[in-house]
Interface confidence: medium
């Protein structure tokens, strides 16, 4: 059975403070404990969460934690359930609020000798006790002709007089704590002899040379004095006007009239009312000169038929703020319909081709008028003037494919070759009218081409196949000078292509026939065994019916290919001694020898005193140093052939002989000793 060792109990709690509803359970099996609030499961939050079986509150909330809590224990296996006693919180709280006018309904209705009631909006539980203050001084019951109940939230002043004027605040306290008003109330009950505003002057905006009028009236008993001042504190009267206010008139009712306003008249005007008692009342109003700036330019716009588009007109800066309207063909646009004005926007709903044209945004205020045109183009889908045609283009020459279309605005044309966009380069050029030029047509240009002509309204496309008319040419052209190895088999290839497969044959340049050991097999000149006599000039001739013939001249040289008689060996030399790297090659023509040391060619004319290359090709290095170590390559070459062989050179310190080494002990590595 499930047994509650500790059950939750109802308790006092403070708003925003910690609390804990205890619950402890004893049971034999796997028990799952959870909490209900007014019958609904309680979900863990950072503020309220289960701690073991108990429910912990990091900060009690009078709204979220009001209600009945219950601890529920459930056996996950048997389904047995036990519920604790109900528990709830008595939450103590206090919350600040403003001082508000309860009676009369508005401040404007407060008159001397009327009753005024203020209300303190501080709430709490338990019910708070209130204290009122005027200008920070506590008020007590019956004090200075006011009725106050300190336990109540209302303060009544009956009747209210000028002596009650001041800043009213309240504080309240209960078992939770204390709070004071969040916003206080200023009570102002005027003295009849004080100047009071009847009519205040307003800011005005006027155009240059127009007139401006400021109205100003005060009341008091006895009647107050009224005076006008301009910015520099100069008084304005009908008898003494400042030089820049020659055209100013002050009327008996207090109004000030300015005629033929100039920029220097712009500024702050002060109307001052002075009663028999009390401070002067100063009212200000500003005279602004109307102005309007220029409007920004519009970019031309391109729209598609059937769409909805908007063009926003940014009004120019101006005083007063300029009004804005749109016109088309001199007619002001309506505020509804298919083409209409909405705020500062020109709206074109379901655009038609006929909507194209110039629209004008107008802006105007007292200072004048500005206008700006926007050119609207309604895009159309391109139509064909000339589609690309299947074409035969000659290899090596320029070729043209046409794609001529018309639309509004002028269409853009792009070309694709084998579905790949053609970007203009040295071989491809797209003209303004859409024609594609292929410079120097090549065989692999024979494929599909597609042109797409587009405007914002849509696009059209067409494709054409290009067939390249191949020129008669050698593929590849034979090398003009070639070598053959004496006494060996040799082949000299010659192949060509054209519109028709060409016939290929070889001739000797002097017109003599080929010897019997030389055969011409489908363009390949075959020497079974090369003799000295096979050297000479040969011509490869390729021909077909439609394109005629082409010739390639080849000079064949017979040579004995290079072999090395002596090759350099891996050599180790003591520092300071002389190294000899031998190299001898043979061949016909007689090969020349060059040496490469440490990845650079050794120039015989710039070797210096330590190095020397002998006539037979050997390389000698005197007084060797460690930096001479490295790989040395002997290169033998003639007009037909080049061969190389390499060997490393090691430069080492001469070892000091040890006792154990007899005089006959060989050095530990192969040496050249000098």
């Amino acid at each position: 059975a499930i047994v509650f060792i500790k059950q939750p109990s109802s308790q006092d709690a403070l708003q925003g403070r910690r609390a804990l509803l205890r619950c402890e359970v004893e049971a034999p099996g796997l028990v799952h404990v959870y909490w209900l609030l007014d019958g609904a499961p309680v979900q863990d939050t950072e503020r309220r969460f289960t701690q073991g079986s108990s429910l912990s509150f990091a900060a009690v909330d009078r709204l979220q934690d009001s209600g009945t809590f219950q601890c529920v224990a459930r056996d996950d296996v048997t389904g047995e359930e036990a519920r604790s006693a109900n528990a709830s919180f008595n939450i103590k709280w206090i919350e600040a609020g403003p001082v508000v006018l309860k009676h009369p309904a508005s401040e404007a209705e407060i008159q001397p000798q009327t009753q005024v009631t203020l209300r303190c909006h501080i709430d709490g539980h338990p019910r708070p006790t209130y204290q009122w203050f005027r200008d920070g001084t506590p008020l007590s019951d019956g004090q200075s002709n006011n009725t106050v109940s300190s336990k109540e939230r209302n303060l009544t002043l009956r009747p209210a007089g000028p002596e009650h004027s001041g800043l009213y605040s309240c504080c309240a306290h209960n078992a939770f704590g204390q709070a004071c008003s969040s916003q206080n109330f200023t009570l102002s009950i005027a003295d009849e002899s004080f100047a009071r505003v009847v009519l205040a002057p307003q800011d005005v905006i006027v155009a240059r040379n127009e007139e401006a009028m400021f109205h100003c009236q005060f009341s008091a008993q006895p009647p107050p004095n009224l005076q006008w001042l301009f910015e520099d504190e100069t008084p304005i009267t009908n008898r003494s006007r400042p030089p820049h206010l020659r055209r100013a008139t002050v009327f008996a009712n207090g109004s000030l009239l300015l005629t033929q306003v100039r920029p220097r008249n712009a500024g702050v005007y002060r109307c001052i009312g002075q009663g028999q008692r009390g401070p002067p009342v100063i009212l200000e109003a500003t005279l602004h000169l109307a102005e309007i700036e220029d409007m920004p330019l519009f970019e031309p716009r391109v729209f598609t038929a059937g769409s909805e588009e908007r063009v926003t007109c940014l009004p120019p800066k101006g005083l007063p703020e300029p009004s804005v309207w749109w016109e088309h063909a001199g007619v002001r646009l309506p505020t509804h319909g298919r083409v209409y004005q909405k705020g500062h926007e020109l709206v074109l709903a379901s655009i038609a081709e006929s909507d194209a044209g110039v629209y004008t945004c107008h802006a105007a205020n007292l200072a004048g008028q500005r206008r700006q045109d926007v050119n609207i183009t309604v895009a159309t889908v391109p139509t064909w003037l000339k589609k690309p045609q299947d074409s035969q283009l000659e290899e090596g020459k320029p070729g043209y494919l046409h794609c001529l279309t018309q639309a509004t605005p002028k269409p853009t044309v792009v070309w694709y070759r084998n579905q790949m966009l053609i970007s203009e380069d040295s071989r491809f050029e797209v003209f303004k009218n859409g024609t594609l030029r292929i410079n120097n047509v090549e065989v692999y240009d024979g494929t599909w081409y597609r042109c797409v002509s587009s405007t914002p309204a849509g696009s059209i496309e067409a494709q054409a196949r290009v067939q390249v008319l191949e020129k008669l040419k050698f593929t590849p052209p034979p090398q003009p000078q070639q070598c053959m190895e004496f006494d060996k088999e040799a082949t000299v290839p010659c192949s060509a292509t054209g519109r028709e497969k060409p016939t290929i044959k070889w001739e000797r340049a002097d017109g003599s026939s080929l010897p019997e050991w030389v055969t011409d097999n489908a363009g390949t000149l075959h020497f079974a065994r090369v003799t000295r006599d096979d050297a000479g000039n040969y011509t490869c001739i390729a021909s077909n019916g439609p394109q005629g013939q082409i010739r390639a001249h080849v000079q064949l040289t017979v040579a004995v290919f290079i072999t090395f008689k002596v090759e350099p060996e891996r050599t180790t030399v003591y520092q300071g001694h002389t190294a000899l790297l031998q190299c001898e090659a043979q061949g016909d023509p007689k090969p020349l020898i060059q040496w490469k040391g440490k990845d650079r060619i050794l120039d015989p004319t710039k070797l210096g005193p330590r190095m020397h290359i002998f006539q037979n090709g050997s390389l000698v290095i005197h007084d060797v140093a460690p930096e001479d170590s490295g790989r040395y390559t002997c290169i033998a070459g003639n007009s037909c052939n080049i061969k190389h062989t390499e060997a490393p050179l090691y430069v080492v310190d001469k070892p000091v002989p040890e006792e154990s080494e007899g005089p006959g002990s060989p050095p530990p590595y192969k040496m050249i000793q000098t």
Epitope: V33, P41, S53
Partner: antibody
Framework: QIQLVQSGPELKKPGETVKISCKAS????????MSWVKQAPGKGLKWMGW????????TYVDEFKGRSAFSLETSASTAYLQINNLKNEDTATYFC????????????????WGQGTLVTVSS | DVLMTQTPLSLPVSLGDQASISCRSS???????????LEWYLQKPGQSPKLLIY???NRFPGVPDRFSGSGSGTDFTLKISRVEAEDLGLYYC?????????FGGGTKLEIK
């Protein structure tokens, strides 16, 4: 005794929708939440999220937001998993598992499981 | 999300041997109420998973006492003192402290 019985296997094409049911018996349905767990063939277990049977509010793991939806038929003590716009990677066995509403004193999350429903998505 | 990493992936044992499976979390899985919701489940082929251990070390009723769980913070272990044939299958660790709840990748206990 407490049981969770799931609907039978489903063979679906990509783009279709599947709705799996999980019927609970042996306890008061609205006193425990219901979790859904996915197991792809030869793979491990993945918790998809759960539904609070008392309030009906579902909670989804980010990976399963969008195409998966948990729902209830409280009167029939049944929870449902619906997967829309099925993809090949939705091929898996889906388990329902009873889970408590909250973190309790001696609780475990998945004491009771359904037998699993195999959903195969293939074109 | 809390990543649960199980080692080894596969554990070949002889019947009667001791087996030990490790589970490591990518961050602490202590809940803000002080409890650690780390559970172990066993899944046999073609079956749904079964609860073995809850809250790190508590054996679920009916689970033999040869199964024990231990660990704290981020490192947890399931030990089987003497493996029996019925213990073979896939073992998963699971954390239920931080949403989204996550399972480990699984460890397959099989006969050598």
């Amino acid at each position: 005794q407490i049981q969770l019985v799931q609907s039978g296997p489903e063979l679906k094409k990509p783009g279709e929708t599947v709705k799996i049911s999980c019927k609970a018996s042996g306890y008061t349905f609205t006193t425990y939440g219901m979790s859904w767990v996915k197991q792809a063939p030869g793979k491990g277990l993945k918790w998809m999220g759960w539904i609070n049977t008392h309030s009906g509010v579902p909670t989804y793991v980010d990976e399963f937001k969008g195409r998966s939806a948990f729902s209830l038929e409280t009167s029939a003590s049944t929870a449902y998993l619906q997967i829309n716009n099925l993809k090949n990677e939705d091929t898996a066995t889906y388990f329902c598992a009873r889970s408590p509403f909250d973190y309790g004193s001696r609780g475990a999350w998945f004491v009771y499981w359904g037998q699993g429903t195999l959903v195969t998505v293939s074109s | 999300d809390v990543l649960m990493t199980q080692t080894p992936l596969s554990l070949p044992v002889s019947l009667g041997d001791q087996a030990s499976i490790s589970c490591r979390s990518s961050q602490s899985i202590v809940h803000n109420n002080g409890d650690t919701y780390l559970e172990w489940y066993l899944q046999k082929p073609g079956q749904s998973p079964k609860l073995l251990i809850y809250k790190v070390s508590n054996r679920f009723p009916g689970v033999p006492d040869r199964f024990s769980g231990s660990g704290s913070g981020t490192d947890f272990t399931l030990k089987i003192s003497r493996v029996e044939a019925e213990d073979l299958g896939l073992y998963y660790c699971f954390q239920g402290s931080h949403v989204p709840w996550t399972f480990g990748g699984g460890t397959k206990l099989e006969i050598k």
